[in-house]
């Protein structure tokens, strides 16, 4: 097995992930592993020399960079919060704070905004990934209601009066629950006509 540095006439290396072509010497050299950087470039007689990234810096991939990337914080003012710290091999992992979605993306989320409220009679469609997009409000399905303006409230099933030994006084809608009454209670005058069938 050939180990770097080795000559390459066609400008390609056997292991593209862990080696790179150095055009000045027309050789293939080792890349540095994640968490390290190039402290001395390769030559015909000596392979790449790597060194560990200093504190508060990282390199995520096999590389031939002469510096490490600076760790960046998750800025709360931009709606972000940290979920995992920066290491020598991985940048700080950020997400949107609760009740927010990513509103600006440049390789990673840079700015979050508050999720829109869903009006009464609707709920936010459940997403595969939290924080990925703004709310898409969908109507409550039959037999369910939601009576607030909220980014997170879920549609609830209408109360079944009979389960509580009561009778229905007014049917539920998408925005309101069923109204129940005692079977012995007299009906209000305006409703008595509709109930005497």
């Amino acid at each position: 097995q050939v180990v770097p540095p080795y000559g390459s006439e066609n400008q390609t290396c056997r292991d593209q992930e862990k080696e790179y072509y150095e055009p000045r010497h027309r050789i293939c050299c080792s890349r540095c592993p994640p968490g390290t950087y190039v402290s001395a470039k390769c030559s015909r007689s000596r392979d790449t020399v790597c060194a560990t990234c200093a504190e508060n810096s990282y390199n995520e991939h096999w590389n031939y960079l002469t510096i490490c990337q600076l760790c960046r914080p998750c800025d709360p003012v931009m709606g972000l919060e940290e979920i995992a710290p920066c290491t020598s091999k991985r940048k700080t992992q950020c997400r949107c704070q609760p009740g927010m979605f990513c509103a600006a993306w440049a390789l990673e989320c840079t700015h979050c905004e508050l999720l829109s409220d869903c009006p009464p009679g609707t709920e936010a469609e459940l997403k595969d990934e939290v924080g990925k997009g703004n709310n898409h409000c969908v109507p409550c399905k039959a037999g369910h209601f939601q009576n607030t303006s909220s980014p997170s409230a879920r549609c609830q099933p209408h109360t079944r009066c009979e389960d509580q030994g009561l009778v229905e006084a007014a049917p539920g809608t998408a925005q309101s629950d069923t109204t129940c009454r005692n079977p012995s209670e007299s009906l209000p005058p305006e409703m008595s006509g509709t109930m005497l069938m």
């Epitope: 998750c74 003012v77 704070q97």
Partner: nanobody, 112 residues
């Protein structure tokens, strides 16, 4: 918008300690991450410490090991415990969060 009131600054000798407080109103406190920022004379405002909703903390390398950020959700308050203070820590300190109004800040002066 979120209102923030910082307090606890003052004049302290090098090596001394201070505890800054930040009282927040106008938001669901437990749903917000917070940061402490500072601005030294003639310099840009910089982020020095953050705390997430879950209590995860981040510190700038210049304060790591000396400063501690914490939160008390019951009191709607974020704290910054500052130990082993140095003259270069002299600045106006602010706390802030999403849609927070920048307050007056609290001045920390480290001098002998």
């Amino acid at each position: 918008d979120v209102q923030l009131v910082e307090s606890g600054g003052g004049l302290v000798q090098p090596g001394g300690s201070l505890r800054l407080s930040c009282k927040a109103s106008g938001t669901t406190f437990s749903d917000r991450a917070f940061g402490w920022y500072r601005q030294a004379p003639g310099k840009q405002r910089e982020l020095v410490a953050t705390i997430s909703t879950a209590g995860l903390t981040w510190y700038d390398v210049s304060v790591k090991g000396r400063f501690t950020i914490s939160r008390d959700n019951a009191k709607n308050t974020v704290y910054l415990q500052m130990n082993s203070l140095r003259p270069e820590d002299t600045a106006v300190y602010y706390c802030n969060t999403f849609r927070g109004n920048w307050g007056q800040g609290t001045l920390v002066t480290v001098s002998s």
